[in-house]
Amino acid sequence: MHVAQPAVVLASSRGIASFVCEYASPGKATEVRVTVLRQADSQVTEVCAATYMMGNELTFLDDSICTGTSSGNQVNLTIQGLRAMDTGLYICKVELMYPPPYYLGIGNGTQIYVIDPEPCPDSD
Amino acid sequence: MHVAQPAVVLASSRGIASFVCEYASPGKATEVRVTVLRQADSQVTEVCAATYMMGNELTFLDDSICTGTSSGNQVNLTIQGLRAMDTGLYICKVELMYPPPYYLGIGNGTQIYVIDPEPCPDSD
């Protein structure tokens, strides 16, 4: 299953990055799981994941650094709390969970660049 | 003449971006000219330029947004005062001016990403 995501995104100076992950669904899935993975060197780690029913809201866990909304075959993902050391390749993984058959789709990744802000001068 | 420069550089939150431009000199040049070009869409504009004598300091004009140092066949370039709207592809162009023959080398460009900082809160 094909998954498209932007090649590059700049995090805001507040450490927030948003991007769209779009998948070409081969069937009529009712349950979809979206996972954001971070690839550094050859290590792949899970950043966040959410399962949603088509037409319903996308809900990440309360302590997740991700939020998102879904619309058809598009998922709008936002990652918060990013620091310069979090700069890296963020891969969108989409799984059509139900009904069978299961389908897997993995995007090419979005390179997110994060720049730490300069501290504001102390107010006297 | 081959010119190497990094593919991507992030400007600091103060709007400063630095990168190295390295050229493979086919001869023993004594006078070298370095130009930074910005390519946006298909438009190419000159950002800054400096001519220097090998072994001497690299000097840009006083009102230039560029500064630099040279060491052998390497030039360390710094561009200042960058804003988010200046994000783009910055190409390093090297010309061996003297003695003849003249040589031209153009790098593949460095994509400089610039994020405008959040304004600091007013001090009361």
């Epitope: 299953m1 094909h2 792949v44 899970e46 799984e95 299961y102 389908y103 897997l104 993995i106 | -």
Partner: antibody, heavy 118, light 107 residues
């Protein structure tokens, strides 16, 4: 380090049942799908079943559908395969294997042998 | 069901030689293809995933290529420990399927 350890294999008569277990350690169990894959003596690998994440979504090979049930207990970090109505052709080494974040099976157990014979 | 066909069934080579193994899918699996190595009495070991990415700890003499329906596993210079059975597997959709395997043995 990641470890998967199967147990529960043995000799069983045709038509009888057996339950295999796979104990996992060294990783966040609930974040991974887990497969059962089997290998008949001297034969190739055959996919049997998969169970995903919280255990609600499962898939089976046609050869075991309706006879085998895959389940998991995330609190115990354990995977199960309940095998009913066993046949001689179910004789095999059964492996559990973890699904890597990008999809392949990156860690396998050592396998447990099931022999269906009268 | 996606059927995977591997060829040749057996490959007889000497240490130091190059091994080229083929896996063909009955329909496109994009790049969702993995290669595994299995030695007698052992569990399979992941070598290649995503058609061409080497798994952690796998020597660079192993390489994978291809996409869609045609895939290749290449071992550039066979070491004594490389003589084993190699399986391809598609993991892009269920039912997940394995190829029948290629045995690489010593000539």
């Amino acid at each position: 380090q990641v470890q998967l350890v199967e147990s529960g294999g043995g000799v069983v008569q045709p038509g009888r049942s057996l339950r295999l277990s796979c104990a996992a350690s060294g990783f966040t169990f609930s974040s991974h799908g887990i497969h059962w894959v089997r290998q008949a003596p001297g034969k190739g690998l055959e996919w049997v079943a998969v169970i995903w994440y919280d255990g609600r979504n499962k898939d089976y090979a046609d050869s075991v559908k309706g006879r085998f049930t895959i389940s998991r207990d995330n609190s115990k970090k354990t995977l199960y395969l309940q095998m009913n109505s066993l046949r001689a052709e179910d004789t095999a080494v059964y492996y559990c294997a973890r699904v890597a974040p990008l999809g392949p099976l990156d860690y396998w157990g050592q396998g447990t042998l099931v022999t269906v014979s009268s | 069901e996606i059927v995977l066909t591997q060829s040749p069934g057996t490959l007889s080579l000497s240490p130091g030689e190059r091994a080229t193994l083929s896996c063909r899918a009955s329909q496109s699996v994009s790049s969702y293809l993995a290669w595994y190595q299995q030695k007698p009495g052992q569990a399979p070991r992941l070598l290649i995933y995503g058609a061409s990415s080497r798994a952690t700890g796998i020597p660079d003499r192993f390489s994978g290529s291809g996409s869609g329906t045609d895939f290749t596993l290449t071992i550039s210079r066979l070491e004594p420990e490389d003589f084993a059975v190699y399986y391809c597997q598609q993991y892009g959709r269920s039912p997940f399927t394995f190829g029948p395997g290629t045995k690489v043995d010593i000539k």
